[in-house]
Structure formats: structure tokens, C-alpha cells
């Protein structure tokens, strides 16, 4: 079976040129058109361009001035260069084959490679990804919350972009694994007490504990699952007020 694999840098600086390569295995690269398609996190797909194994190309007019594609039949590879990068070029980049010259449907795709255009090095804390940065940034607040039993407490989680209702909340007690409390922003996981509730959609979400019990003192994490890779907030520790 034909397989495609993208390779290239995960992090590129603004104004630089992105270079990606797609390696085709399980079949010959010859006599097919090959394409690049990209998908900003949580968004739709955008066709970048196509190349035939003879080297002839067609590009999306909106990107034409910045795109160059090439093919190396001896290595069964084709490549994309995208110049003058900006943050708007942050996306998952897919290479794909299409079935015949005219029809343009893509029968085989690579798994995609995430390209982040940023002048920084990416976050290393919480649910961040350490070197390349995940595309969706999550800000959880407060990081520490002091409360007494019986209190009502609220924890906030804010996204850098719209994630619809694809948000979950977890509770983690010291020395234990996290446990799922809420999914789909407001749906209570089976067995979770009704004093826990979640609300919000889009970019702003809230976890509320209506009457704090002694067993609720723990660290709480939000998690988005709208875009790949799934990421977590940095956590909110709910501690006993002395």
C-alpha cells in the first residue's frame, strides 16, 4: 500500500522559508500528480498546489508568489518551499496523492506535520509541547486557590482560539493519576458528584465546585481536544485556607 511521510522542521521563524519533503513508499512516484494541503489548528483545509512527476506545477493563486514545488523521482520524494512566513502559516501540512490527473481527489495522505511559525521557542510548561509549541495556548487561572469547605469556587480556562465545546476537566490528588470530571465543556462524567459543573464554549470555560468538600482539595486541569495535539492547562491547585 502507498504510504506518504512528511518531514521538516516543527518550528520556523517569521520571514524565513519553510522546506518540507514528502517521501513516498509502497509505490512509484511516477505518473501521478502530488499535492500539498494545509490545515491551521481547528480550521478547514487549504490546497497549496500540485506537481506532476515531469516537474510541471500548479499553485493556489493566493500563495503562488511564495510557493515552489519540486520532485525527485530517483528518491521517490517531492518537496514544498514556502517563503516569507508569518504566524498565519502555522498549520498542519499534509502531502497527498491524487487518483488521476483530472479528478483531483486525494486517495492517499501523509499523517501531517505540524509547523509553528513563531519567533519564540515554544512553551515548556503544563500541557505545552516543550520545543515546538502546540498551536492552541491555554491559560488556566488562578494557579492557586485558597478556600474553605462549603465555599463555592470557580476556575477559569481560556483558549487562544475557538475550540467549540471540546473541553474536559480533570481532578488530580497528590500521588494519584488525574480523573475525568467533565467532558464536552459541561457534561458530568458518570459517578462525579453534582456539585461539580462546567460551562462555556468557544474560548472561555469555567469549572465550578458549588460546595467544596474536604475531598475536593486537589489540582484541577482543563484539556482541549478540538485540535491535534491534545493539550492541557497548567493546573489550578485548590488548597485549604488556613
Amino acid at each position: 500500500q502507498v504510504q506518504l511521510q512528511e518531514s521538516g522542521p516543527g518550528l520556523v521563524k517569521p520571514s524565513e522559508t519553510l522546506s518540507l519533503t514528502c517521501t513516498v513508499s509502497g509505490g512509484s512516484i511516477s505518473n501521478y500528480y502530488w499535492s500539498w494541503i494545509r490545515q491551521p489548528a481547528g480550521k478547514g483545509l487549504e490546497w497549496i498546489g500540485r506537481i506532476y512527476t515531469s516537474g510541471s506545477t500548479n499553485y493556489n493563486p493566493s500563495l503562488k508568489s511564495r510557493v515552489t514545488m519540486s520532485v525527485d523521482t530517483s528518491k521517490n520524494q517531492f518537496s514544498l518551499k514556502l517563503s516569507s512566513l508569518t504566524a498565519a502559516d502555522t498549520a498542519i501540512y499534509y502531502c497527498a496523492r491524487y487518483y488521476d490527473i483530472l479528478t483531483g481527489f486525494f486517495d492517499y495522505w501523509g499523517q501531517g506535520t505540524l509547523v509553528t511559525v513563531s519567533s519564540g521557542g515554544g512553551g515548556s510548561g503544563g500541557g505545552g509541547s516543550g520545543g515546538g509549541g502546540s498551536v492552541i495556548w491555554m491559560t488556566q487561572s488562578p494557579s492557586l486557590l485558597s478556600a474553605s469547605t462549603g465555599d463555592s469556587v470557580t476556575i477559569s480556562c481560556r483558549m487562544s482560539q475557538d475550540i467549540s465545546s471540546y473541553l474536559a476537566w480533570y481532578q488530580q490528588k497528590p500521588g494519584k493519576a488525574p480523573e475525568l470530571l467533565i467532558y464536552a465543556a459541561s457534561s458530568l462524567q458518570s459517578g462525579v458528584p453534582s456539585r461539580f459543573s462546567g460551562s462555556g464554549s468557544g474560548t472561555d470555560f469555567t469549572l465550578t465546585i458549588s460546595s467544596l468538600q474536604s475531598e475536593d482539595f486537589a489540582t484541577y486541569y482543563c484539556q482541549q481536544y478540538d485540535s491535534f495535539p491534545p493539550t492541557f492547562g497548567q493546573g489550578t491547585k485548590v488548597e485549604f485556607k488556613r
Epitope: 500548479n58 483530472l102 483531483g104 481527489f105 464536552a184
Partner: antibody, heavy 119, light 112 residues
Framework: QVTLKESGPGILKPSQTLSLTCSFS??????????VGWIRQPSGKGLEWLAH???????HYHPSLKSQLTISKDTSRNQVFLKITSVDTTDTATYYC???????????WGPGTTLTVSS | DVMMTQTPLSLPVSLGDQASISCRSS???????????LHWYLQKPGQSPKLLIY???NRFSGVPDRFSGSGSGTDFTLKISRVEAEDLGVYFC?????????FGGGTKLEIK
Amino acid sequence: QVTLKESGPGILKPSQTLSLTCSFSGFSLNTFGMGVGWIRQPSGKGLEWLAHIWWDDDKHYHPSLKSQLTISKDTSRNQVFLKITSVDTTDTATYYCVRRYRYDVFDYWGPGTTLTVSS
Amino acid sequence: DVMMTQTPLSLPVSLGDQASISCRSSQSLVHSNGNTYLHWYLQKPGQSPKLLIYKVSNRFSGVPDRFSGSGSGTDFTLKISRVEAEDLGVYFCSQSTHGPWTFGGGTKLEIK
């Protein structure tokens, strides 16, 4: 009852390869939509998703760690495996095995296995 | 560019239900050769899209027969006769009649 349990070496030297095993019960990785993966948590820090394998053998990796990670499964033995090559001290963490199903959230977690990377 | 408009954005269904997704193009997708190059893809979370239907109504190899495509000109529909858990994800329509090839914004099929 769904349970997951991680096992690993506990301690490794820098540059070695980490091999983790997740043994689970109460569900099958043959079920449509079912997945098992790995999340890690350095001591006192936040959570980071690493990799996932689905019922149809599709595999997904954290983009920034993709070159170091390999996930695989033995469906008949109800086990999932993770390999991380060339570990260093920053890989010191508790590693959790997690189930993902239906709502694409991590609905069940193992107790975790601790890895220390030290020379 | 040909604009592709998909409705609804989100489609909550129960397993076993029928689901219907609409795709409308800003101009006719009938090619001068008589063919209509409208295709459907399914993208599961964290995966690349997979081809389901090509040229309006042709199921790609391995695609279950509960998936069917129909339509002509500018109005197209994807139907799933009995939704299964493996069908959850984002569905995209795509046209390759007119350059540049364009995609719809996606419809998220999710459990009610």
C-alpha cells in the same frame, strides 16, 4: 470494570531507551473508536500528551517528540507499549497510560509509573 | 475561487441514526467534460483526512455502503444511513472542477 496499569524500568541513564508497557482490562482495543495512549507529568508540573494508538492501528505522536516515540499494541494480550529513544533528564516524570473513547477525552487513567533519568 | 459552504457546522447524532450533511458551491461544479468533481472526506481527531466519496456519488474502496453521496450543479449531500462510533469526526466536501481546488469548512459529527 476498566483498569489500566503501567510498568517500566524506574531508572535509566541518559541516552538509553525507555520501554513502557500498559496492561489493561475491562475493554478491548478491537472496539471501534477505542484508543489507548500515554501522558506524562514531571514532578510538580503539568501534563503532556505523548502518543496514542487506535483500534485500527492508527498511531499519533506529539509533533515535537515524534522522532523519539514509537507506540504499538498487542490486542490479544490487552497491552500497549511505548518506546522513547535517547532519554535525558528532562524525561524524568510519571508516565500514565490512558484510555480514549467516544468523546475523545481521557476517561480512564492508570496509577502511573515513575521514571528517573540520572547518570 | 469557488466557495464551498457546508451545513450544519456541528451535527449531534445518536448511534444508529441517519445523518445528512449539505455542501453548496458558489458556482456549478459541472466540468466542461460533463463530470462533476465533488468529493467527500472524513477527518478523525489527530488524523489526516480519508477519502470517502469521489465525483459526487462514488464510494472509495473500503468505504462502507452506509455512506452515500448525491447532488448536482451546486447542491450536494452526504448521507450516512446508520451512524456508527467509527464515523465520528469532521466531514469535508471538496471541489476540483475549478482551480484552485477548495474545501468546505467542515461538519463535525458528534454523539448527542
